[in-house]
Amino acid sequence: PRSIEVKYIGVKSAYVSYDAEKRTIYLNITNTLNITNNNYYSVEVENITAQVQFSKTVIGKARLNNITNIGPLDMKQIDYTVPTVIAEEMSYMYDFCTLLSIKVHNIVLMMQVTVTTAYFGHSEQISQERYQYVDCGRNTTYQLAQSEYLNVLQPQQ
């Protein structure tokens, strides 16, 4: 079998809302993945599991099941959204994210994603990790090139 390549492209959008009473930030982060099937047979993408960390704390998790089928020598782009919550012991970040004097409230988040693929009854897991800047102060839609530019760490090979 030839390789199945997973490339984390970056953050596509981040939609923010606040709970003033709880001093909590809610960030819905949509990410983009490219999955390439270099084989001469179809491959099933069984699931994608993702998690987001801020300051070594997991702030959001997501799992997508029965996603798609990728044909021979084909590539598919998949978007997935991770709902994240910055609260409790990290509520000090609420001060930063809601401060009007700052116009771009960039925070560094660790994006982790694992793609499980299956073909002929065989499963394979491919993982990626990437640090990304995300603006916690306003709704943001990123250009994919811009998202690449925002990366501080290249994905693990």
Epitope: A20, Y92, L100, G137, T140
Partner: antibody
Framework: EVQLVESGGDLVKPGGSLRLSCAAS????????MSWIRQTPDKRLEWVAT????????VYPDSVKGRFTMSRDNVKNTLYLQMSSLKSEDTALYYC????????????WGLGTSVTVSA | DIVMTQAAFSNPVTLGTSASISCRSS???????????LFWYLQKPGQSPQLLIY???NLASGVPDRFSSSGSGTDFTLRISRVEAEDVGVYYC????????FGGGTKLEIK
């Protein structure tokens, strides 16, 4: 209903000190940044200070930096402005206002408290 | 500091007609994030300032849609489509791209 009520304004001599207070009600005070703005006798508006929701960050213009200190008590729902080394140009009506993180504006203002610096 | 410039008085307007108030900033208020950090406040006689417009063109809560605002990065106009007696007061433009600064205010004059 959002309400902001300033107090503490007075007549003070140059070089003197004064502490203004702003009592907030009608919203979750600890969830919002707050600002002080003053209106001079010629009706010009000048931003004086901003404090973040939890009091972690304060920002001042150069005109008051080192002389004014903004603070807050989120238990008492009260905002403060400690003013020292007062000058005649500090004479103004002082307003407190709520910072809105969605509009990026100061969306509610109090009625103000008057500070006069004169010998 | 960014300087905000306004005329002290508007051209006198008749009730029911439209009015325009202008404001100019010494630097573009358009941030690279696409937001223009320009605001309009109205101070009615004996009252504190009230927010009318935020981020150049958005109407604040409770503000009648007779009010509208437009502009480029440095030149801005507040329009009142049908002036009412309650619109009388001083209109201030303000920016917070780089900390807050206000214009000197424009007094709306009624004929």
């Amino acid at each position: 209903e959002v309400q902001l009520v300033e107090s503490g304004g007075d007549l003070v001599k140059p070089g003197g000190s004064l502490r203004l207070s702003c009592a907030a009600s009608g919203f979750t005070f600890s969830g919002y940044g707050m600002s002080w703005i003053r209106q001079t006798p010629d009706k010009r508006l000048e931003w004086v200070a901003t404090i973040s929701s939890g009091g972690r960050y304060t920002v001042y213009p150069d005109s008051v930096k080192g002389r004014f200190t903004m603070s807050r008590d989120n238990v008492k729902n009260t905002l403060y402005l400690q003013m020292s080394s007062l000058k005649s140009e500090d004479t103004a009506l002082y307003y407190c206002a709520r910072d809105n993180f969605y509009s990026y504006a100061m969306d509610y203002w109090g009625l103000g408290t008057s500070v006069t610096v004169s010998a | 500091d960014i300087v905000m410039t306004q005329a002290a008085f508007s051209n006198p307007v008749t009730l029911g007609t439209s009015a325009s108030i202008s404001c100019r900033s010494s630097k573009s208020l358009l941030h690279s994030n696409g937001i223009t950090y320009l605001f309009w406040y109205l101070q009615k006689p004996g009252q504190s300032p009230q927010l009318l417009i935020y981020q150049m063109s958005n109407l604040a809560s409770g503000v009648p849609d007779r009010f509208s605002s437009s502009g480029s990065g440095t030149d801005f106009t507040l329009r009142i489509s049908r002036v009412e007696a309650e619109d009388v007061g001083v209109y201030y433009c303000a920016q917070n791209l780089e900390l807050w600064t206000f214009g000197g205010g424009t007094k709306l004059e009624i004929k």
